[in-house]
């Protein structure tokens, strides 16, 4: 499932290159292992912002699919309460390219620990 998430992120990256979306997104670029579920939640919430701002059907479908995949992969530990983690709004704002790169890094963290 996580490998498919990375495929979807690459697809989103390709799709947005043809658009002019100037959004800056809350991005966790240095995820601590004890905060990875919280960070994933922030990435997924921000991904929905990309979908809404783009107004593009392909991006919308890909984001929705990515959320479904991530949800299922995390169904066992998605409700784990992680303490001492940053709120999404406390994260640094970065452009979409940097956001997606950081997203891939966190997904790789989940792949490495699964």
């Amino acid at each position: 499932n996580w490998v498919n998430v990375i495929s979807d992120l690459k697809k989103i990256e390709d799709l947005i290159q043809s658009m002019h979306i100037d959004a800056t997104l809350y991005t966790e670029s240095d995820v601590h292992p004890s905060c990875k579920v919280t960070a994933m939640k922030c990435f997924l919430l921000e991904l929905q912002v990309i979908s809404l701002e783009s107004g593009d059907a392909s991006i919308h479908d890909t984001v929705e699919n990515l959320i479904i995949l991530a949800n299922n992969s995390l169904s066992s530990n998605g409700n784990v309460t992680e303490s001492g983690c940053k709120e999404c709004e406390e994260l640094e704002e970065k452009n979409i390219k940097e956001f997606l790169q950081s997203f891939v890094h966190i997904v790789q963290m989940f792949i490495n620990t699964s």
């Epitope: 579920v37 994933m40 939640k41 997924l44 919430l45 929905q48 979908s51 809404l52 059907a57 392909s58 919308h60 479908d61 890909t62 984001v63 929705e64 699919n65 959320i67 479904i68 991530a70 949800n71 299922n72 995390l74 169904s75 998605g78 409700n79």
Partner: antibody
């Protein structure tokens, strides 16, 4: 008002195939994900399949995966369910339903068609 | 898979009474983004199911305010404050937080 008209049901032998259709009208079909849900003779509801707005992504429960294929033709405003290797437990009333977007709405099935009956029996 | 357990199986009521249907999931259905995709559907005799409530407590367009949804995590409730004749039928809860999406077994609301 949203209209969903399911058709294609019938009597089929175990191991056989059938293709259901669902004609959509009075809304922009390509703006919505779509699902098939079935109701067994005991009145139990079972989710069968979901397809994304553009048709690139499909989802199934294990009970039908590899046997059923959901597809759509946005130019024809039509949803399909190709069923093969049918079993007696596939006997049910099959409904098509429109899905509200997870991102902009509640991810619910807000409108349902009237259903088409499938009987698998020798 | 998430198992959805509905109680009671049958609910005999008098018109004007309050009715309450319970739905329990085998695991939390709060998704990673914090949403709980729990719906309630009503199927009247001879009709297709119709959406009543989505995301636990949101009433769908045109649904009377005597219907209300509540709950969180694994325990959910549908309440009908004053049952009317048109409310009779089969009620189903449904989770679509996690694939495979699953329905409860149904509750038949009938006249006492």
């Amino acid at each position: 008002e949203v209209q969903l008209l399911a058709s294609g049901g019938g009597l089929v032998k175990p191991g056989g195939s059938l293709k259901l259709s669902c004609a959509a009208s009075e809304f922009t079909f390509s703006n919505y994900a779509m699902s098939w849900v079935r109701q067994t003779p005991e009145k139990r509801l079972e989710w069968v399949a979901t397809i994304s707005r553009g048709g690139d992504y499909t989802y199934y429960p294990d009970s039908v995966k590899g046997r059923f294929t959901i597809s759509r033709d946005n130019a024809k405003n039509t949803l399909y369910l190709q069923m093969s290797s049918l079993r007696s437990e596939d006997t049910a009333l099959y409904y098509c339903a429109r899905r509200v977007s997870m991102i902009t709405g509640g991810w619910a099935m807000d409108y349902w068609g009237q259903g088409t009956s499938v009987t698998v029996s020798s | 898979d998430v198992l959805m357990t509905q109680t009671p199986l049958s609910l005999p009521v008098s018109l004007g009474d309050q009715a309450s249907i319970s739905c329990r999931s085998s695991q939390s259905i709060v998704d990673i983004t914090g949403n709980t995709y729990l719906e309630w559907y009503l199927q009247k005799p001879g009709q297709s199911p119709k959406l009543l409530i989505y995301k636990v407590f949101n009433r769908f367009s045109g649904v009377p305010d005597r219907f209300s949804g509540s709950g969180s995590g694994t325990d959910f409730t549908l309440k009908i404050s004053r049952v009317e004749a048109e409310d009779l039928g089969l009620y189903y809860c449904f989770q679509d937080s996690f694939v495979p999406y699953t329905f409860g077994g149904g509750t038949k609301l009938e006249i006492k």
